[in-house]
């Protein structure tokens, strides 16, 4: 059977903007040379502010008549970018976002690129390759990921509040040790979600609590010492886990130390 392993390639462009390309060896379903050719759809999470490259099926230009990219974004008319090999012409219909372009000349590379991915790029992208014997399709459900900003503070006696602000999709917050917790979600018009978890610990031998925020862009753990006197200076310390230590919580200073990164948060 074909190998459907996912290949997510990450590089740096100008040492600043990460670029990712999701092009996997999709399963070919053209059995018995039926004219119902490969239709493959991929769900693809991509981080905001990166560059993204979307690929067509692996078919040589010599076999093609037309290459079309169909782009369906929320609240917008369907945009199509087409290349006709016979006349070597390209045509666009209803395409207004200048950040979505062919990677290069379509006769050299049929890939589509999105420069500096924004929340508005959430949507469905499909490459249609027209051959003399039928069409090959490659579709992407693009989900733009936004890293939430994480804060942790104590707001009253033995009660801590952990917030993951404006993430997409919503982050998940858990605590160690478990306390008496209430979690609320606030949805913003741009599609991001703020998650707020407030926990209380009645047991007095619990002196330090950890808030663990899980998100598709990476995980973050912050911890705080529960102080008995309200209004005293409190600190939240934390470290990343997993491959991506990318949460940059507001008012958190990053210090290099023997144990990795330590984050000090001062609540006034």
């Amino acid at each position: 059977q074909p190998n459907n392993s996912l290949m997510l390639q990450t590089s740096k462009e100008n040492h600043a903007l990460a670029s990712s390309s999701l092009c996997m060896d999709e399963k070919q379903i053209t059995q018995n040379y039926s004219k119902v050719l490969a239709e493959v759809n991929t769900s693809w999470p991509v981080k905001m502010a990166t560059n993204a490259v979307l690929c067509c099926p692996p078919i040589a230009l010599r076999n093609l008549i037309i290459i079309t990219w169909e782009i369906i974004l929320r609240g917008q008319p369907s945009c199509t970018k087409a290349y006709k090999k016979e006349t070597n012409e390209t045509k666009e219909t209803n395409c207004t976002d200048e950040r979505i372009t062919w990677v290069s000349r379509p006769d050299q590379n049929s890939d589509l690129q999105i420069r500096t991915v924004a929340i508005t790029h959430d949507g469905y992208y499909r490459c249609i390759m027209v051959t003399p014997d039928g069409n090959f399709h490659r579709g992407y459900h693009l989900q733009v990921l936004v890293t939430p900003e994480v804060t942790l503070f104590q707001n009253r006696n033995r009660t801590a509040v952990c917030k993951a602000v404006a993430g997409k999709p919503a982050a998940h917050i858990s605590w160690i040790p478990e306390g008496d917790c209430a979690t609320k979600q606030e949805y913003w018009s741009n599609g991001t979600v703020t998650v707020k978890s407030t926990c209380h610990w009645e047991v007095h031998n619990v002196s330090t609590v950890t808030c663990h925020v899980s998100h598709l862009t990476g995980n973050k753990s912050l911890y705080i010492e529960l102080l008995p006197v309200p209004g005293a200076k409190k600190s939240a310390k934390g470290g990343g886990s997993g491959l991506n230590d990318i949460f940059e919580a507001q008012k958190i200073e990053w210090h290099e130390g023997s144990g990795g990164h330590h984050h000090h948060h001062h609540h006034h």
Partner: antibody, heavy 119, light 110 residues
């Protein structure tokens, strides 16, 4: 069932020309690019060129430009490879192969035609 | 043009052996996430038979003891347990813009 049937073996003198045919069946002939490949005794497979019967586009390996001519007869679903100014080093088995769209791979090959160039 | 170098050019093995053949391209044959490298088996007097396409995809009807891997410039064909019918010559092949074959690896009985 897809089949590619090639013409029979040929013996030619140096300087002569040879024309090998490849009759396709079991699919729409004009829908797929046909490649021609040869294999001299004990040598690696060598690409000669391809023809796209859909639009008659052709492309040749630089080594064979000017000597090889690829044509097709759509009504007969047949591709042809003609090689001129034959020399002894052209002695080889010549294959036609249909390029499949996905991955540009060759699933279907002709049985091969042995062309011997000898004085 | 891209040159493909296969190694070894020949090898002797016994039934049941694990056999590995490598193919190195003079420049990357991977583009848009796909590696345009295929593997063929050829027996005397016969045309090549496709085994693996796009580096790692097993062609329909080919036994699962055959597998392919690699990307960029370095590729491998592996036969996990050599069978009597596997004694043949194996070729790697690249076909993105121009068609190129490796020099072949002849697998003989030890």
């Amino acid at each position: 069932e897809v089949q590619l049937v090639q013409s029979g073996a040929e013996v030619k003198k140096p300087g002569a020309s040879v024309k090998v045919s490849c009759k396709a069946s079991g699919y729409t002939f004009t829908s797929y690019v046909m490649f021609w490949v040869r294999q001299a005794p004990g040598q690696r497979l060598e690409w000669i060129g391809y023809i796209n019967p859909y639009n008659d586009d052709t492309k040749y390996n630089e080594k064979f430009k000017g000597r090889a001519t690829l044509t097709s007869d759509k009504s007969a679903s047949t591709a042809y490879m003609e090689l001129s100014s034959l020399r002894s080093e052209d002695t080889a088995v010549y294959y036609c192969a249909r390029e499949d769209y996905y991955g540009s791979r060759f699933v279907y090959w002709g049985q091969g035609t042995l062309v011997t160039v000898s004085s | 043009d891209i040159q493909l170098t296969q190694s070894p050019s020949s090898l002797s093995a016994s039934v049941g052996d694990r056999v590995t053949i490598t193919c190195r391209a003079s420049k990357s044959v991977s583009t848009s996430g796909y590696s345009y490298m295929h593997w063929y088996q050829q027996k005397p007097g016969k045309p090549p038979k496709l085994l693996i396409y796009l580096a790692s995809n097993l062609e329909s009807g080919v036994p699962s003891r055959f597998s392919g891997s690699g990307s960029g410039t370095d590729f491998t064909l592996t036969i996990s347990s050599l069978q009597p019918e596997d004694f043949a010559t194996y070729y790697c092949q690249h076909n993105r813009e121009l068609l190129t074959f490796g020099g072949g690896t002849k697998v003989e009985i030890k």
